[in-house]
């Protein structure tokens, strides 16, 4: 049963297609695992910022630094990859920034194209020149984490020399990694010394040791993989957004919606009404109406403008979005002033970050 | 694990009406669409409509309006798509699937038979 | 409602062919197509959505690409166990609309 009487159909979809839509998008910012970021939080005149990742608050810890306006990540990881907001709290306003981290390896996803130089790293030695196991290119070796999207291949190397010309191995979790341990099972490329995986699912996560050893010596060198998942996802709007505003009669108003969404998205702008004087329906759902939506008449879909407003203006107003997958939903009041009651100027609008198309 | 799992095989007769239930586990039933899709013997796929949980937002093919309704009980996590005026032609598997397509149901045979 | 036409209807390829079957939207959809393989008697299962993100856990030989009105799916080295039908399918605006489909079969 909807939640809601309508006064306007608001379905999940408009009878017309929308219009093809920008949608606004996060600055991103890549940092390869083991890497340290640091991020300024782009708002000016901030009095208190806090900082949130997925929509959780964020605090310092041992990794996360935070100081003034910068935050700081030591030893990225790719459980740090998510989406990151900075509020700056003002006495009258607050105000938040979106960024994107992405903490990836992209080296680990279908390299095979650098297998050419493999050759370089099988060492043959001179036969009186006895040797237990070295590192020939550590360089190939210096990401440990990677994160890598399901269904890539990833590749492992530990080129390596010594003589007699060592064999490799490759532990899972620290056991014998078999075969039958993975559908599709691996490949060893001795001659290269990497161990291949091909469409990584996430029960391929955990540690990957390459063990090299002759009658001389061992030596070992671990690796983290992560697989990071790709489903369809909802739409998200900027928290914080769209904020609440207050005009004098006669004044004009702007209400923001920040919506991220990989598929279309159909925006709404929804208020409460009255209908014959009352503001809920026999079924005591209230009463909406629909005041805008993204479709073929319709301008920039996240931005409600309102001009010259009445008391009867007044209430809240919902910026509701929906794609294929789902819906979301955020809603800011207004609060509409008689002139003798001006606050400081005629007109006030939104303090909502830029919008950005 | 996510499952979609539906009511059984009906058979039906011509001007009747036919409701499909859709039970799922595994995620948050209220935060995703449910679609319902429909195929034909040897034919091809025909989206009919979806509902929003949450809120009991409904959108529908025009070709299915006023003889589609979808509906969604939130405490059981089941959705559910009527049919009525039934006839020959609505014989067809009928397939729930999780709001990115991304999870169906087994399916529902529909049987429109005199 | 938007139309997509997808083509071939049907198809035969060897073991190890590359094949690819492409879609067109009768209106510009963006990137907001998705790709299902359907075999005898069971649901459709989601391959590609966004026209070319691979859903978690589809094989990487499996890809898809375009913009706009024109779309393509491609299989880049054909395995037995892909012998089913391939659909594409309009997430831009309902009615959400499919190809007809497109049977595909080993030499």
């Known amino acids: 049963r909807p939640s809601f009487s309508l006064v306007e159909d608001t379905t999940l979809e408009p009878e017309e297609p929308p219009t093809k839509y920008q949608i606004s998008q996060p600055e991103v910012y890549v940092a390869a695992p083991g890497e340290s970021l640091e991020v300024r939080c782009l708002l000016k005149d901030a009095a208190v910022i806090s900082w949130t990742k997925d929509g959780v608050h964020l605090g310092p810890n041992n990794r996360t630094v935070l100081i003034g306006e910068y935050l700081q990540i030591k030893g990225a990881t790719p459980r740090d990859s998510g989406l990151y907001a900075c509020t700056a709290s003002r006495t009258v306003d607050s105000e938040t920034w979106y960024f994107m981290v992405n903490v990836t390896d992209a080296i680990s996803s279908g390299d095979d194209e650098d297998d050419t130089d493999g050759a370089e790293d099988f060492v043959s030695e001179n036969s009186n020149n006895k040797r237990a196991p070295y590192w020939t290119n550590t360089e190939k070796m210096e990401k440990r984490l990677h994160a890598v999207p399901a269904a890539n291949t990833v590749k492992f190397r530990c080129p390596a020399g010594g003589n007699p010309m060592p064999t490799m191995r490759w532990l899972k979790n620290g056991k014998e990694f078999k075969q039958e341990h993975r559908i599709g099972g691996y490949k060893v490329r001795n001659q290269h010394w990497s161990l291949i995986m091909e469409s990584v699912v996430p029960s391929d996560k955990g540690n990957y040791t390459c063990v090299v050893e002759n009658e001389y010596g061992s030596i070992n060198h671990t690796y983290h993989l992560d697989v990071v998942e790709r489903s369809p996802h909802r739409p998200i709007l900027q928290a914080g957004l769209p904020a609440n505003a207050s005009t004098v009669v006669g004044g004009d108003v702007e209400f923001v919606c920040k919506v991220y969404s990989d598929a279309q998205p159909h925006i709404q702008w929804i208020k409460h009404v009255e209908k014959n004087g009352s503001k809920y329906g026999p079924d005591g759902l209230p009463y909406l109406k629909v005041l805008k939506h993204s479709g073929i008449n319709s301008s920039n879909a996240e931005v409600l403008a309102l001009f010259n407003v009445t008391e009867a203006d007044a209430g809240e107003y919902i910026c509701k979005v929906s794609n294929y997958i789902g819906q979301a939903n955020q809603s800011a009041w207004l609060t509409v002033l008689p002139k003798q009651q001006a606050p400081g100027r005629e007109k006030e609008i939104t303090a909502s970050p830029d919008y950005l198309e | 694990q996510v499952q979609l799992v539906q009511s059984g095989a009906e058979v039906k007769k011509p001007g009747s009406s036919v409701k499909v239930s859709c039970k799922a586990s595994?995620?948050?039933?209220?935060?995703?669409?449910m679609h319902w899709v429909r195929q034909a013997p040897g034919q091809g796929l025909e989206w009919i409509g979806a509902i929003f949980p949450e809120n009991g937002d409904t959108s529908y093919n025009q070709k299915f309006k006023g003889r589609a309704t979808i509906t969604a009980d939130k405490s059981t996590s089941t959705a559910y798509m009527e049919l009525s005026s039934l006839r020959s032609e609505d014989t067809a598997v009928y397939y729930c699937?999780?709001?990115?397509?991304?999870?169906w149901g087994q399916g529902t045979t529909v049987t429109v038979s005199s | 409602d938007i139309q997509m036409t997808q083509s071939p209807s049907s198809l035969s390829a060897s073991v190890g062919d590359r094949v690819t079957i492409t879609c067109k939207a009768s209106q510009d959809v963006s990137t907001n197509v998705a790709w299902y393989q359907q075999k005898p008697g069971k649901a459709p299962k989601l391959l590609i959505f966004s026209a070319s993100y691979r859903y978690t856990g589809v094989p990487s030989r499996f890809s898809g690409s375009g913009s706009g009105t024109d779309f393509t799916f491609t299989i880049s080295s054909l395995q037995p166990e892909d012998i089913a039908t391939y659909y594409c399918q309009q997430h831009y605006s309902s009615p959400y609309t499919f190809g007809q489909g497109t049977k595909l079969e080993i030499k």
């Open positions: 699937a999780r709001g990115g397509f991304d999870y």
């Open positions: 595994g995620y948050t039933f209220t935060s995703y669409n």
